[in-house]
């Protein structure tokens, strides 16, 4: 049998059953999530669930830029350091940098400090690039 690899929306990239869209425009976290949803297909800010997935994403983004942090779909909606993925994925894989997670930093970004392989928490109102994900 021939198994066709699903296609992603134009400008998105495919990896292991998921499509990813990297957007180099500035949004706060909630507007970024709403924009991801607006693309349909059940898209959300991206969940990153393994080192392999993180490495693939990091390699892709590094081809565009290496200095700007990028919103992902991890947040702390109750503001109690109880982090969860906005798409409902299980929060098992963790890749936090050593930065403090205190204050009003309740949304997660891929940090440019370690080639986008680690995450930092940041204020959700900050305007940043963002990464969307959906399963085609």
């Amino acid at each position: 049998d021939i198994i066709m690899r699903p296609s992603c929306a134009p400008g998105w990239f495919y990896h292991k059953s998921n499509c990813y869209g990297y957007f180099r425009k500035l949004r706060n976290w909630s507007d970024a999530e709403l924009e991801c949803q607006s693309y349909g297909n059940g898209a959300h800010l991206a969940s990153i669930l393994s080192l392999k997935e993180a490495s693939t994403i990091a390699e892709y983004i590094s081809g565009y830029q290496r200095s700007q942090p990028i919103w992902i779909g991890l947040h702390d909606p109750q503001k109690r350091q109880q982090w969860q993925w906005i798409d409902g994925a299980m929060y098992l894989y963790r890749s936090w940098s050593g930065k403090s997670m205190g204050g009003n930093k309740h949304c997660a970004e891929m940090s440019s400090n370690n080639n986008f392989l680690t995450w930092s928490s940041n204020e959700c109102n900050k305007r940043q690039h963002f990464l969307c994900k959906y399963r085609p």
């Epitope: 425009k25 500035l26 949004r27 706060n28 507007d31 009003n104 109102n125 900050k126 305007r127």
Partner: antibody
Framework: QVQLQESGPGLVKPSETLSLTCTVS??????????WAWIRQPPGKGLEWIAS???????DYSPSLRSRVSMSVDRSLNHVSLRLTSLTAADTATYYC??????????WGRGTLVTVSS | YVLTQPPSASGTPGQRVTISCSGS????????VYWYQQLPGTAPKLLIY???QRPSGVPDRFSGSKSGTSASLAISGLRSEDEADYYC???????????FGTGTKVTVL
């Protein structure tokens, strides 16, 4: 209830530098996750966004004013400052300070009128 | 000004008035539109956020909508206290900054 109060010189000469301060009350700049913005309105005209700054100093500037504008945050005094250089009569306006949540402005200060004239 | 509005609009008490706001793909086309009301001699106030949402305290006579690169603000049941300047605004991805509309003066006849 967050309140913003702008203060400035009122009258400035052409070619000089304008310094304005926005004092924030009812909120702590470095504990609230907001940008703080400056918006101006020439007499009888529309609104123009100048710049927004986060408490950590991250700032976004209007492309048309970027070369003349700088913003800073004084977390100890809980205020935000704007500097606009090389003033001309076209910079005469009411200057407003506003809280910026990353996509909109709310609330706004009352504004302070700055006249550029010799 | 990157966003275009009609300079004026008017109506009698009780009437419905609509204000348009036209932009481009980099601002209104790909970002939320916000509306601000500026009563005479006062600072602007947020009236509509995220295209069609009203902050608490804003009467439901005010409504916003967006289609493509154009947005509109409707005031139904016009009242004398609605006499003000109205501005649309949006983030612009090309400029990486906010842009405002030219403003519309609403007069209650």
């Amino acid at each position: 209830q967050v309140q913003l109060q702008e203060s400035g010189p009122g009258l400035v000469k052409p070619s000089e530098t304008l310094s304005l301060t926005c004092t924030v009350s009812g909120d702590s700049i470095d504990k609230s996750s907001y940008y703080w913005a400056w918006i101006r309105q020439p007499p009888g005209k529309g609104l123009e966004w100048i710049a927004s700054v986060f408490y950590d100093g991250t700032a976004d500037y209007s492309p048309s004013l970027r070369s003349r504008v700088s913003m800073s945050v004084d977390r100890s005094l809980n205020h935000v400052s704007l500097r606009l250089t090389s003033l001309t009569a076209a910079d005469t306006a009411t200057y407003y300070c506003a809280r910026d949540d990353g996509s909109s402005f709310d609330p706004w200060g009352r504004g302070t009128l700055v006249t550029v004239s010799s | 000004y990157v966003l275009t509005q009609p300079p004026s609009a008017s109506g009698t008490p009780g009437q419905r008035v609509t204000i348009s706001c036209s932009g481009s793909s980099s601002n209104t086309g790909s970002n939320y539109v916000y509306w601000y009301q500026q009563l005479p001699g006062t600072a602007p106030k947020l009236l509509i956020y995220r295209n069609n949402q009203r902050p608490s305290g804003v009467p439901d006579r005010f409504s916003g909508s967006k289609s493509g690169t154009s947005a509109s603000l409707a005031i139904s049941g016009l009242r004398s206290e609605d006499e003000a300047d109205y501005y649309c605004a949006a983030w612009d991805d090309s400029l990486s900054g906010y842009v405002f509309g030219t403003g519309t003066k609403v007069t209650v006849l």
